[in-house]
């Protein structure tokens, strides 16, 4: 082992204080006791150490805790967290939501780093499920967090946690994710009355099946076009012109602007032209009058 340089006389640190910002790297290494550092970690964040000095402090903690830091140290890492690698973080056992919040605060305003992703993964796995408080915290720091999870991971979200989800949290979710989230949302909001229910469920409707959309069409919900355009194409196709008209209410005229885009384009192709004409929007491409519509999926099922 390389012989360590001795601490110069009078420079041994008795506490973690601002005098240490004037220590050279080798002096920090020689004069700061790792155990002292661990017990006074909460001071480190209040002192403007350079990145090079933080490297030294991290090294001292690594030597003291080769199996991973205890939560009492993790909670007070502050900017030292930015020095941690995903490998370091995999050694941790983080159970306190306060610790998670403290570390997310350090990374606030930045993209989710590999360190943060690993931290969240460790935390959620430790808890066993994505409970409401955790989801609340994660989506507050990272609105896109929910949509970064796989459908399998989303399946561990309990319906009660859905209350914490804001519309913007679902902006980047794909249909497979909404397929998982929608039934949970339906369950979570089931006791709400019509208009309140629609406000809450609206963001999740990209995962709704046809029968639920039909039911909504009977409730005067006035769905906006942006929401309609995010619906599953296979759920929209079986809706009748009358059902779509009721579903959209005054927003129905927006169909004209979207007639070349899915799911509107595909839905138009499935409707009788004379039914489309009743909307008075000039929608073209429906099935000409007198043509017989065969439900091929039904035919295949019978044969």
């Amino acid at each position: 082992e390389v012989e360590k340089t001795a601490c110069p006389s009078g420079k041994k640190a008795r506490e973690i204080d601002e005098s240490l910002i004037f220590y050279k790297k080798w002096e920090l290494e020689a004069c700061v006791d790792a155990a002292l550092l661990a017990t006074q970690m909460d001071r480190v964040n209040a002192i403007p150490f350079t990145y090079e000095q933080l490297d030294v402090l991290k090294h001292k903690l690594d030597e003291l805790y080769p199996q991973g830091y205890p939560e009492s140290v993790i909670q007070h890492l502050g900017y030292l967290f930015l020095k941690m690698s995903p490998e370091d973080i995999r050694k941790w056992n983080v159970t306190s939501l306060e610790t998670l919040k403290a570390l997310l605060e350090v990374n606030k305003g930045h993209e989710m780093s590999p360190q943060v992703a690993t931290l969240i993964d460790r935390f959620v796995k430790g808890r066993g499920q994505l409970d409401k408080d955790t989801l609340d915290t994660l989506t507050a720091f990272y609105p896109g967090y929910l949509c970064s999870l796989s459908p399998e991971e989303l399946s561990s979200v309990p319906p009660s946690s859905i209350w914490a989800v804001r519309p913007q949290d679902l902006d980047t979710c794909d249909p497979r994710q909404l397929d998982v989230l929608y039934p949970k949302a339906r369950l979570a909001f089931q006791n709400m009355n019509g208009s309140e229910y629609f406000v809450k469920i609206q963001s999740f409707l990209g995962g709704a099946p046809t029968e639920d959309l039909k039911a909504l069409s009977q409730q005067n919900v006035s769905m906006d076009l942006a929401t309609f355009m995010k619906l599953r194409t296979d759920a929209v196709l079986p809706l009748t012109v009358a059902e779509v008209q009721k579903l959209l209410g005054p927003h129905v005229e927006g169909l004209k602007a979207e007639e070349r885009h899915r799911p509107v384009r595909d839905w138009i192709l499935r409707q009788r032209q004379d039914d489309l004409d009743t909307l008075g929007l000039g929608l073209q491409g429906g099935i000409p009058n007198g043509y017989l519509v065969l439900d091929l999926s039904m035919q295949e099922a019978l044969s």
């Epitope: 420079k11 005098s19 004037f22 909460d42 209040a46 002192i47 403007p48």
Partner: antibody, heavy 116, light 110 residues
Amino acid sequence: EVQLLESGGGLVQPGGSLRLSCAASGFTFSNYAMSWVRQAPGKGLEWVSGIPPDSGSKYYADSVRGRFTVSRDNSKNTLYLQMNSLRAEDTAVYYCAKNMLSFDYWGQGTLVTVSS
Amino acid sequence: QSVLTQPPSASGTPGQRVTISCTGSSSNIGPNAVSWYQQLPGTAPKLLIYYNSKRPSGVPDRFSGSKSGTSASLAISGLRSEDEADYYCGSWDSDLRGYVFGGGTKVTVL
């Protein structure tokens, strides 16, 4: 016991000069940054200057930059403030304080009066 | 005009809790630690709170400090007559490259 003892204050005419000293004891002076803070009569605290242990960088308030110079002699455990081109608004009690980010020990202060 | 903003005065009766606010910006309180100083009449200032919430030895636990974002506050619980003094907040300012104080808050015990 940490002690800071200022000296050198007094009455000086506008445009004149004065040199304040602060003798430190009870701690390893050469390890710590030091600062000067002043307080005009009946007013609040105003930071004047700061100097790290090795005198590498020196920091000044805009109100004194170019007129005041901070220095230290670690072998004598003493902090200095050379004040030139003094103005009436420099009239204040001048304190020396240990550290630069949180002043954990203060001297009793020395009064500087700039008046004709 | 001080860089950090404090209320000029605060008061309370003995035993009450008094809170003093200190508002700064993203160049001082935001990234840096806040300290609080007590100045009794006719004496030099004394450090009361450092590193946002730490108390030096000898300072009663009736005094507590906290920081959130670009603001900080000092709370005095169980107010006593000997707490009548001027209280200053302070922080390093990264843009000014210097230390800044609040204008001070005079605490009166009624």
